[in-house]
């Protein structure tokens, strides 16, 4: 198992400081850490040195050392804080994509461990995080949403108090995908329709999906009908509706109607027969 020097789990330095991290193993060792500036890497057989003579808040993060040849796959880690009063947050990513049910890590890292007790998470625009969202804060990792739901998809900002002043990170866009994405669910109502010529009629084609990126159309035979689209969001689902309203039906309105909904995954179709009779 590799060993890191300095032999502490956490290291706190000021901006501009010189930082040297050394990893020693039995065989060759490798470093992994946040993508950040100014590091130089020097490897010499079984040891590897990461160093900077100008630490910045962007160097804040966990540096892990592994020994690729180690059958046990052991690793060692050290977390570096570069305590910069002008930069309370170091964002390791601005977009995070997970599948629902997974842990979602919003990687905003505090640059000063003393800030950990005053952190909070908000949705962009100053809105509170949804009440049902279960999350916690880890100084080494950021905010962690325990079991992400599709509904948690949003832009989040991390906040903390520095000397009585609020310090806010830039936004992190969280996208939570369905475990098994599927074509939209559709409904075509009524399932069949018979009208006397001159009567009113309504045919409603609706589709729902967890993702907003889908389309729904209503066709008579092979002809796509130009009908306004109504959109809504309820019970964690996006709903899109095209409703054909006829004040006085005629024989040319009769035929096979198809409701077609599609997204990147596929298409679903429902059909119904509309008959128009003389009397």
């Amino acid at each position: 198992i590799p060993v890191i020097e300095p032999s502490v789990p956490e290291l706190v330095v000021k901006p501009g400081a010189t930082v040297t991290l050394r990893c020693v193993g039995n065989g060759s060792v490798e470093w992994d850490g946040p993508p950040s500036p100014h590091w130089t890497l020097y490897s010499d057989g079984s040891s590897s040195i990461l160093s900077t003579n100008n630490a910045t808040f962007q160097n804040t993060g966990t540096y892990r050392c592994t020994e690729p040849g180690d059958p046990l796959g052991g690793s060692a880690a050290i977390h570096l804080y570069v305590k910069d009063p002008a930069h309370s947050w170091n964002l390791l990513a601005q977009e995070v994509t997970v599948v629902e049910g997974q842990e979602a890590v919003l990687p905003c890292l505090i640059t000063d461990p003393a800030l950990k007790d005053s952190v909070s998470l908000m949705r962009e625009g100053g809105r509170q995080v949804l009440r049902k969202t279960v999350y916690f804060f880890s100084p080494w990792r950021g905010f962690i949403i325990r079991k992400a739901k599709v509904l948690d998809s949003n832009t989040y900002v991390c906040k903390t108090m520095v000397n009585g002043r609020e310090s806010t990170s830039t936004g992190i866009w969280l996208k939570v995908n369905r475990v098994h994405p599927e074509p939209p669910q559709i409904k075509l109502e009524p399932s069949k329709l018979v009208r006397i010529r001159g009567e009113a009629a309504q045919i409603v084609c609706s589709a729902t999906n967890a993702e907003v990126g889908f389309n729904v159309i209503l066709k008579r035979g092979d002809t796509k009908l130009e009908i306004p689209l109504n959109s809504d969001f309820q019970d964690n689902y996006y709903k899109k509706v095209r409703a054909l309203s006829l004040n006085a039906v005629d024989f040319q309105d009769a035929g096979i109607y198809s409701c077609v909904a599609s997204n990147d995954v596929g298409t679903r179709t429902a059909t119904m027969n509309f008959q128009v009779v003389e009397s």
């Epitope: 198992i1 060993v3 300095p6 502490v8 290291l11 706190v12 400081a17 060692a76």
Partner: antibody, heavy 118, light 107 residues
Framework: EVKLEESGGGLVQPGGSMKLSCAAS????????MDWVRQSPEMGLEWVAE??????????FYAESVKGRFTISRDDSKSSVYLQMNSLRPEDTGIYYC?????????WGQGTTLTVSS | DIQMTQSPASLSVSVGETVTITCRAS??????LAWYQQKQGKSPQLLVH???NLADGVPSRFSGSGSGTQYSLKINSLQSEDFGSYYC?????????FGGGTKLEIK
């Protein structure tokens, strides 16, 4: 509030054994690196042993003077760290402190006294 | 093993004075040095980590400096509560050796 409380010290004859315990509270014990440090008028402060967290494979390290005689262990379910001391010598006499390592030895217990004497 | 040599071993000073304690490592410890204060009958307390960073709650009259093998702890305008013993310790690998200590006494 971080609290570390040592117990198990006392008088023991040379060649004897003793087990020290340290009960921790006020922090996530399973994530912590824990050490034992001892102090005597002759040797001053002397680092004895360290056990790291599960994330660091519970790696253990010892001072040369106690290697092969002392064993550090932990029970994360009880938030406790232990020091099993065998083949004790008079020079092992001193106050034994349990400490938590973060950026340094951030927190110390009040200490427990071990006397090795015939 | 890295040896830590601390000086002076003892110091007799008056309240309000400024004192400097030094610590020399037998090899480069890359600023991985901590300073501790210990009052009579009490456990040591962390004062400074990573050579220059004050631990939480430590008054600003304390300051740490140094790099490579040479380090120092400075206490400006000594207060009565500052009297006691001070120790340096390196964190560049194990064993984590301490300096021999400096006893600060009231003149």
């Amino acid at each position: 509030e971080v609290k570390l409380e040592e117990s198990g010290g006392g008088l023991v004859q040379p060649g004897g054994s003793m087990k020290l315990s340290c009960a921790a509270s006020g922090f996530t014990f399973s994530d912590a690196w824990m050490d034992w440090v001892r102090q005597s008028p002759e040797m001053g402060l002397e680092w004895v042993a360290e056990i790291r967290s599960k994330a660091n494979n519970h790696a253990t390290f010892y001072a040369e003077s106690v290697k092969g005689r002392f064993t550090i262990s932990r029970d994360d379910s009880k938030s406790s760290v232990y020091l099993q001391m065998n083949s004790l010598r008079p020079e092992d006499t001193g106050i034994y402190y349990c400490t938590r390592v973060k950026v340094g030895f951030d927190n110390w217990g009040q200490g427990t006294t071990l006397t090795v004497s015939s | 093993d890295i040896q830590m040599t601390q000086s002076p071993a003892s110091l007799s000073v008056s309240v309000g004075e400024t004192v400097t304690i030094t610590c020399r490592a037998s090899e480069n410890i890359y600023s991985n040095l901590a300073w501790y204060q210990q009052k009579q009958g009490k456990s040591p307390q962390l004062l400074v980590h990573a050579a220059t960073n004050l631990a939480d709650g430590v008054p600003s009259r304390f300051s740490g400096s140094g790099s490579g093998t040479q380090y120092s702890l400075k206490i400006n305008s000594l207060q009565s509560e500052d009297f006691g013993s001070y120790y340096c310790q390196h964190f560049w690998g194990t064993p984590r050796t301490f300096g021999g200590g400096t006893k600060l006494e009231i003149k």
